[in-house]
Amino acid sequence: PEPPTACREKQYLINSQCCSLCQPGQKLVSDCTEFTETECLPCGESEFLDTWNRETHCHQHKYCDPNLGLRVQQKGTSETDTICTCEEGWHCTSEACESCVLHRSCSPGFGVKQIATGVSDTICEPCPVGFFSNVSSAFEKCHPWTSCETKDLVVQQAGTNKTDVVCGPQDRLRA
């Protein structure tokens, strides 16, 4: 018979013959021959292959590097890679989450508009007139200036976007 020019799914062509691919979780040891089947071997500890393949080496599981703010979300198997995610207080630098960075803090004069998540950073906004923030924080919103009037006090020092107003006693009118 004519040697094949194409093979079925889960097969590959070698030496004019169709050999079975190795299943996920296994690597190729030797190609099939006219008389023998493809020889495959399971991937070792901390290795994987996630497709039908003819790879002679398994891939190492991804290392979730704590130096990059990463931790293991899901441990890898012989057929799947390890999935990493960010440590608490960190967020991914891209959709693929290959590394993480610490959430940004909002500087004094700015408040948190949106608290960071594992995939998005802190969103800051400038404190508008009547509000202030005197700390660098990843959680604190802008606070409203103290209302001196409700305490029967008067404004002694005006507030800014970084400082609260300073209240003081009303001047007593002497008889």
């Epitope: 891939h59 991804k62 990059l68 891209s94 959709e95 290959e98």
Partner: antibody
């Protein structure tokens, strides 16, 4: 063993399109991204583009209109095309493992000269 | 556009000297900064990740510090093999993935 190897033309003419291929081994493109970084002779490194393990493509803003990055996970290749080449694009072009991240693994680089 | 400004662009030092290189980002990048060493004709070698963490196999004389916009690479006691060019790199986001202009460390 993790390896990355760049291939493509060593000489291109001005206005031509450059196509570079990065062939990887020892890791899966479904697990790691790949970026292209270049270095003109005697000058600094310049990040050009990256493709994440999820297939997302990212480009340097200054070169976005000229670049396309793509991958073939089965062939284990990442391809960068750069249109309208100019002599100032003469550089060593590196591919490195990683998308938007740090780059611990690099290819040896390929020098591309743009000249008529 | 986002920028990383590295200084100095070059410096001369002797073996045993303490060397400091700075990198300034045009906007906050939190801890998303790496440092590399490059020797002529070779690809860069990763030294520091996350602004202050030593990459695998890097000698402890190298250290990094900083967060936000200002970062520093320090070599506590310069060795003969440390004469090279050093680059900072931001990886905070896709729009801020950039290399600094480099610092060439030469023998005095």
């Amino acid at each position: 063993e993790v390896t990355l190897k760049e291939s493509g033309p060593v000489l291109v003419k001005p206005t031509e399109t450059l196509t570079l291929t990065c062939t990887v081994s020892g890791f899966s493109l479904s697990s790691y991204g790949v970026s292209w970084i270049r270095q003109p002779p005697g000058k600094a490194l310049e990040w050009l583009a990256g493709i994440g393990s999820d297939g997302s493509a990212y480009y340097a803003s200054w070169a976005k209109s000229r670049l396309t990055i793509s991958r073939d996970t089965n062939l284990k290749q990442v391809v960068l095309t750069m249109t309208n080449m100019d002599p100032v694009d003469t550089a060593t072009y590196y591919c490195a493992r990683g998308g938007i991240t740090v780059y611990a693994m690099w290819g040896q680089g390929t020098l591309v000269t743009v000249s008529s | 556009a986002f920028q990383l400004t590295q200084s100095p662009s070059s410096l001369s030092a002797s073996v045993g000297d303490r060397v400091t290189i700075t990198c300034q980002a045009s906007q906050s990048i939190s801890t998303g900064l790496a440092w590399y060493q490059q020797k002529p004709g070779k690809p860069p070698k990763l030294l520091i990740v996350g602004a202050s963490n030593l990459a695998s196999g890097v000698p402890s004389r190298f250290s990094g510090s900083g967060s936000g916009t200002d970062f520093t690479l320090t070599i506590s006691s310069l060795q003969p093999e440390d004469f090279a060019t050093y680059y900072c790199q931001s990886y905070f986001s896709s729009s801020s993935t950039v290399f600094g202009g480099g610092t060439k460390v030469e023998i005095k």
